[in-house]
């Protein structure tokens, strides 16, 4: 809608709304994946730089996260991933470049990669939500 402020100009109240929408999607995706892929370890080679270091409180680094979800989309629950991507797009700074992410070719490594992304994203949302709640409210 033309009424909507450009996505990178949303106030903390709207960012909080988006985080609240993302949390159950992320949690559900992670829990389902853990049930389906039991015994898969977290990868120590994948680091999701999900928070910006240049703002206080830290904000979700949507441009850094989006490529990972686009990359794992064909290998996970597409419906849920699409909903996550839709929300992350709303938080993205306009004209911020997105890097290409390649998924490991090895099946086991690929599963470990996906699990790590989902775990780190869930932790990241928790961190941002806490910082939004501990602000001057």
């Amino acid at each position: 809608s033309s009424h909507m402020a450009p996505t990178h100009q949303l106030p903390p109240s709207d960012v909080r709304k988006i985080i609240l929408e993302l949390q159950p999607l992320s949690r559900g995706l992670l829990e389902d994946y853990q049930k389906k892929e039991t015994g898969v370890p977290e990868s120590n080679r994948t680091l999701l730089l999900c928070l910006t270091s240049d703002s206080q409180p830290p904000r979700l680094n949507s441009s850094a996260i989006l490529p990972y979800f686009r990359a794992i989309r064909p290998l996970s629950d597409k419906n849920i991933i699409d909903k996550i991507i839709e929300q992350l797009d709303k938080l993205k700074f306009q004209h911020e470049p997105e890097t290409e992410i390649s998924v490991p070719a090895d099946t086991f490594e690929c599963k470990s990669f996906i699990l790590t992304i989902l775990q780190q994203f869930s932790a990241c949302l928790e961190s941002v939500f806490k910082s939004l709640n501990s602000g001057p409210q």
């Epitope: 009424h3 949303l10 709303k90």
Partner: antibody, heavy 118, light 111 residues
């Protein structure tokens, strides 16, 4: 044209529960955010909380222990339940639509007056 | 919570004159150059009606006699010229931070 209509009891006993309905026409409650606000005698307004298009709820911390907002998408209605009411909850209760991030509440109901008294 | 202080509480203006209502937030409601402050009008027995969103944007269908300005913590609603139909209570509110908070209202009367 979007219309919101509040309904519910006009009198509630102290210690009881207040349950209000907001009936929405002209838009689906499965898009946007659907809010409750109340106006106390003397015109002070208080934001109470919302239910989102997906069913996520968020409440004003001042009411968190007493408030529940729910919905019935088949009826295109959403609800406010406030427990353990006191005379301080006497107010006019409004429902309102928040259609888009970065915008404002654009449609409000006409309000329903609730008195808490024994 | 952000405290919204609206003034004056009541205002009496002659037809055709200008009415000015102020709203001050206890902290800035701006982000990246946008102000998340809004104004609405309420007539007795009627639904509140959105007039101005994000400080200065006129809502669709609202006459251009209504205008909003300001940024940061200080905001103004202007009605020029005032018409008989403008008799109402006017409120500001911020949607910058949760919980959203409201001004105390300004009752506009005609002299």
């Amino acid at each position: 044209e979007v219309q919101l209509v509040e309904s519910g009891p006009s009198l509630v006993k102290p210690g009881g529960s207040l349950r209000l309905t907001c009936s929405v026409t002209g838009d689906s409650i499965t898009s946007g955010y659907w809010k409750w606000i109340r106006k106390f005698p003397g015109n002070k307004l208080e934001y109470m909380g919302y239910i989102s298009y997906s069913g996520i709820t968020d409440y004003n911390p001042s009411l968190k222990s007493r408030i529940t907002i729910s919905r019935d998408t088949s009826k295109n209605q959403y609800y406010l339940q406030l427990n353990s009411v006191t005379t301080e909850d006497t107010a006019t209760y409004y429902c309102a639509r928040y259609p888009n991030y970065g915008y404002a509440m654009d449609y409000w109901g006409q309000g329903t007056s609730v008195t808490v008294s024994s | 919570d952000i405290v919204m202080t609206q003034s004056p509480a009541s205002l009496s203006v002659s037809l055709g004159q200008r009415a000015t209502i102020s709203c001050r937030a206890s902290e800035s409601v701006d982000t990246y150059g946008r102000s998340f402050m809004h104004w609405y009008q309420q007539k007795p027995g009627q639904s509140p009606k959105l007039l101005i969103y994000r400080a200065s944007n006129l809502e669709s269908g609202i006459p251009a006699r209504f205008g909003g300005s300001g940024s940061g913590t200080d905001f103004t609603l202007t009605i020029d010229p005032v018409q008989a139909d403008d008799v109402a209570t006017y409120y500001c509110y911020q949607s910058y931070e949760d919980p959203w908070t409201f001004g105390g209202g300004t009752k506009l009367e005609i002299k």
